[in-house]
């Protein structure tokens, strides 16, 4: 019948399994007169036959490893033997079996790792090649450390990436590793095919001497610098080495600082380049790496820190022009009448900002001088010798020296003598009586005035008011302002009223002065009044604990994981629903009940993080009134994107007929996140056939060089496909294929003639 | 050995029709496809068509059509063309061959000929 | 159709000499080009297929070249028998077509 294995002539494909003996015919092509008979040409290799009648068949097993594609071209001819259609290409592609072991290219490697190297940083790779589909699990080959020898405390200090067979430090090996203590290590590593997945794979093994060599690329200890110095800059404060010469250096400034005073040169010496100021900064905290001729990172940067040691620099100085206190007149000697507080910018707790307080001059001298003392150290006046008469003197004028160990600096103090505070604040009312309030009125609202009286002396701290809630208002939602000329209370609203909490609040309130009463003078019920507070009740929509909420997870979480919670409680009692807003890439999901949230789908940090959706919380029943918060979704990196060209190499052509090897660079990216160092891929030719053709070689941690091997390259386009790997946790790998035309040229450009203008090649090497 | 024998001259009328045959022997009939050419007096040869007596596959110069009919009988081994309508530009030396491609072979050429037969159209 | 010209109706030429006779294809016709010798009232015998490959039996003085458009026939010494006439005729798409023919004639 037409179709599966029989039909007119035209282009087709053919899949079939290497190795196996024929057992079917491949298809059955059907002539149009005039067409009576077919021809076979192409890469038959004496194995592909087509009879005359267009039976196209094979007579022997196929080797993929001999040849991959046949590509054959059947034409239908005439009586004559003139073809009259086609020919058409018949492609057979040889599926792979597993019928090749894999090998490694040397039986033993010798390699070095210095002590402290990042972890997971290659620093040997074995090779091992396996003739089979790289593209089938037949030819995938999975690399394993046997063992590793010595092995101390059964902590493996040695890891293999499975897929390109970089060995590299583990966490550990990067921490224990010492030459001093063990210098050398063997370990055996075994090679399966099959992905390393098959009790039917085929392996091989070798062997690895590693060297341990010590590691000179340590953070230096932390370095003292004297603020101000006048020697001549730049200084060299410190140093750092790379382990092998020719690394490029260079500082960087994580705090962004507008002036950052360190330099390094390249020898990996470290100065600071001018004066420094602890009391602008006391201490700076920056980075030295070392870099390869490309810019890229060798190793982790160093922390370097430097300690900016204080000297005397700075006097004291006075907390203001003139500072004045009060002391009433009937005051007792010893008490204390206020605190003189001087600063100083030199370092807190040393000698530099350590003061002193002394007197050195009262005016006036009446009824005589040394009235006053000041506490040396604490800067505390006190009433030194008799009570005061204002009368006589109501004002007093102190001049005090506070020193440091070099400096000294006057400050200037005013006393005024106040009458004795022998009256207590009355208020006019003591009973303000009842208000109602919705429990939605603006915060900031007076919703109260108050007024009490005190006899004493206007203006000073003895008739000055100053009003307390003292009970009712216990959530401090209501505060009392006082005008300082008239004495008067203002109650206003500090935070939300609440008719769930306090539907009814009794508020008494206290009038004191800031100047104690006179021995034998209490406050008493004058001094206090009441009024109550009634709130009603306003329908209020739920209220979130919290403005954001915010959590965080691995892209890679399992379907199903809970990411994080939300809550928010109805003011009236009622209970709450909640619900997602914004969802745009369908990725979560929240129990409408508790407030928590699950993934319902695969996570993608590259897809863009934080991912931000709105939650809406709203009431059951009632007024249904909702509100809405933030949830922020952290995504935190996994190494879950392969390699890749950073962009279209098609177009690469070499002019043929090479004159010498050629060469050519690309450049890989992926989109995980790549923090300090940047990608550090590592490049492989994608199968082992290519070698005879081809290299790759690496360039830096995102270029690589692919060049020919030599000239005798055939005028048609190559297909190199070119493994790389991220060395990520888990490693991950791209097999990605470069076309390369090799070219008539004419004028540096591919030439082609009429009628073959696809794909032509742009880009010449 | 490879032989063609045509048939013998005509002379026909104006409007009639002629049928010329050619006699194979010396291989297998149905393996070759037979050829018929015209030569007029003086000129260079005209190819007229084929015909593959196994298929009974034949083609024809677009020139020809209407005019020639090839037809072959595999039993007697021997091919035939029939002219109709004849017209005195249809004089001429009619000639079959072999085309001696086989299949599998690279033997593209006429390899053997028949003696040529003589059509005159005279009123 | 391809026309196939030869441009020489006619060529003299003494027993002994080299002569060359030319084909010219009206397109491409690859190397599907035989050579025929004809003498008076017998059939065409075949000498040269394929361009340049000589038919079993034909003497070596005579050899055909040429690919594309342009064919040649050579006869690299006369004798007595080539006077005849030649033709040309490409098979490389139909309907198939003959060169008017070149007579050689003796000077």
């Known amino acids: 019948q037409e179709g599966k294995f029989s039909g007119p002539l035209k282009p087709m494909t053919f899949s079939i399994y290497e190795g196996q003996e024929p057992s079917q015919i491949i298809f059955q092509f059907k002539a149009n007169p005039p067409a009576v008979t077919f021809e076979l040409t192409g890469e038959t290799d004496n194995i592909f036959v087509i009879e005359r009648e267009g039976l196209l068949y094979y007579n022997r097993a196929l080797d993929r490893e001999t040849r991959s594609t046949h590509n054959l071209q059947v034409a239908a001819l005439d009586a004559n033997g003139i073809i009259v259609e086609g020919p058409v290409p018949i492609t057979i592609k040889v599926k792979d079996i597993n019928d090749n072991r894999p090998t490694f290219l040397q039986s033993k490697y010798e390699g070095s790792v210095r002590q402290n190297s990042r972890p997971g940083k290659p620093f040997l790779y074995v090779n091992a090649t396996d003739l089979d589909d790289p593209a089938t699990p037949n030819g995938q080959l999975y690399y394993q450390i046997v063992i590793q020898l010595p092995m101390i405390n059964n902590v493996m200090y040695f890891q293999i990436n499975n897929k390109t067979g970089a060995i590299s430090l583990t966490r550990e090996g990067s921490q224990e590793l010492n030459p001093a203590k063990n210098p050398s290590y063997n370990l055996v590593i075994s090679v399966k095919d099959m992905g390393g997945q098959s009790e039917n794979s085929f392996s091989d093994t070798t062997s690895v001497d590693i060297i341990v060599t010590e590691n000179i690329w340590k953070a230096p200890k932390p370095v003292e610098m004297v603020e101000n110095s006048t020697d001549p800059h730049p200084i060299k404060i410190t140093q750092v080495r790379w382990n092998d010469p020719g690394a490029q250096y260079s500082l960087v400034d994580k705090e962004k600082l507008p002036r950052f005073p360190f330099s390094i040169d390249q020898e990996g010496d470290i100065y600071v380049t001018q004066p420094l100021d602890r009391e602008e900064k006391d201490a700076y905290v920056f980075y030295a790496v070392a870099k390869d001729e490309y810019g890229k990172p060798l190793s982790y940067p160093l922390e370097i820190h430097v300690k900016v040691k204080d000297i005397n620099d700075n006097p004291p100085t006075c907390p203001s022009p003139v500072t004045v206190f009060e002391v009433q007149e009937n005051e007792r000697l010893g008490n204390s009448i206020g605190t003189l507080t001087a600063h100083d910018r030199d370092e807190e707790n040393t000698a530099n900002s350590f003061l002193n307080y002394r007197i050195v001059e009262q005016t006036p001298k009446l009824p005589m001088d040394g009235l006053f003392l000041i506490q040396t150290y604490a800067g505390m006046l006190q009433l030194a010798k008799q009570s005061l008469k204002k009368q006589d003197t109501p004002q007093y004028n102190l001049t005090i020296e506070v020193s440091d160990k070099d400096f000294k600096t006057l400050c200037f103090v005013q006393i005024n003598v106040i009458d004795i505070n022998d009256q207590i604040p009355i208020f006019e009312k003591s009973d303000y009586g009842n208000l109602t309030l919705a429990e939605d009125t603006n915060i900031g609202s007076t919703i109260l005035t108050i007024q009490a009286t005190d006899a004493d002396e206007p203006f000073t701290g003895s008739s000055k008011i100053l009003y307390h809630i003292i009970k009712g208002d216990s959530e401090g939602r209501l505060g009392v302002d006082t005008d300082p000329h008239t004495n008067t209370g203002y109650v206003i609203i500090k935070k939300p009223l609440d008719f769930e909490t306090a539907a009814v609040s009794n508020i008494v309130f206290k009038a004191e002065n800031p100047e104690p009463l006179v021995f034998g003078v209490k406050y008493n019920a004058s001094s206090f009044a009441k009024f109550t507070l009634i709130v009603t009740d306003v329908n209020e929509a739920p209220q979130f604990s919290q403005h954001v909420f915010q959590a965080k997870v691995s892209e890679d979480v399992a379907i199903g994981t809970k990411v994080g919670n939300v809550t928010a409680k109805d003011p009236e009692g009622l209970d709450i629903s909640y619900s997602l807003r914004g969802d745009t890439r369908g990725w979560l999901k929240i129990d409408h009940v508790t407030g928590e949230i699950f993934s319902v789908a695969p996570l993608d940090r590259e897809a863009g993080s934080p991912y931000r959706v709105q939650v809406v919380a709203t009431e059951v029943g009632g007024s249904s009134l909702s509100s809405v918060s933030e949830f922020h979704l952290i995504l935190m990196d996994v190494n879950d994107n392969p390699p890749r060209l950073a962009k279209d190499y098609t177009g690469l052509f070499f002019c043929h007929p090479l004159s010498a090897p050629g060469s050519l660079i690309f450049e890989a990216t992926d989109d995980d996140q790549h923090l300090f160092r940047g990608p550090h891929f590592t490049f492989s030719l994608g199968s082992g056939s290519l070698q005879n053709d081809w290299e790759v070689s690496k360039i830096n941690g995102t270029h690589a060089r692919l060049s020919t091997r030599h000239t005798e390259f055939e005028e048609r386009e190559y297909v190199v496909l070119i493994r790389i790997n991220d060395g990520g946790r888990p490693p991950l790998e791209g097999i990605v294929s470069l076309p390369v035309t090799f070219c008539s040229c004419v004028e540096g450009s591919c030439f082609r003639p009429a009628g073959h203008q696809t794909g032509i090649p742009t880009v010449g090497m | 050995q490879v032989q063609l024998v045509q048939s013998g001259a005509e002379v026909k009328k104006p409007g009639s029709s002629v049928k010329v045959s050619c006699k194979v022997s010396g291989y297998t009939f149905t393996d070759h496809t037979i050829h018929w050419m015209k030569q007029r007096p003086g000129q260079g040869l005209e190819w007229i068509g084929y015909?593959?007596?196994?298929?009974?596959?034949?083609q024809y110069n677009e020139k020809f059509k209407g005019k020639v009919t090839l037809t072959a009988d595999k039993s007697t081994s021997t091919a035939y063309m029939e002219l109709s309508s004849l017209r005195s530009e249809d004089t001429a030396v009619y000639l079959c061959?072999?085309?001696?491609?086989?299949?599998?072979?690279?033997?593209?050429?006429?390899?053997?000929w028949g003696q040529g037969t003589t059509v005159t159209v005279s009123s | 159709d391809i026309q196939m010209t030869q441009s020489q109706s006619s060529l003299s030429a003494s027993v002994g000499d080299r002569v060359g006779i030319t084909c010219k294809a009206s397109q491409n016709v690859g190397t599907a080009v035989a050579w025929y010798q004809q003498k008076p009232g017998k059939a065409p015998k075949l000498l040269i297929y394929s361009a340049s490959n000589r038919y079993t039996g034909v003497p070596s003085r005579f050899s055909g070249s040429g690919s594309g458009t342009d064919f040649t026939l050579t006869i690299s010494s006369l004798q007595p028998k080539d006077f005849a006439t030649y033709f040309c005729q490409q098979y490389s798409s139909y309907p198939w077509t003959f060169g008017q023919g070149t007579k050689l004639e003796i000077k």
């Open positions: 061959a072999r085309w001696g491609y086989f299949y599998g072979s690279r033997s593209y050429y006429f390899d053997y």
């Open positions: 015909i593959y007596p196994r298929d009974v596959i034949t």
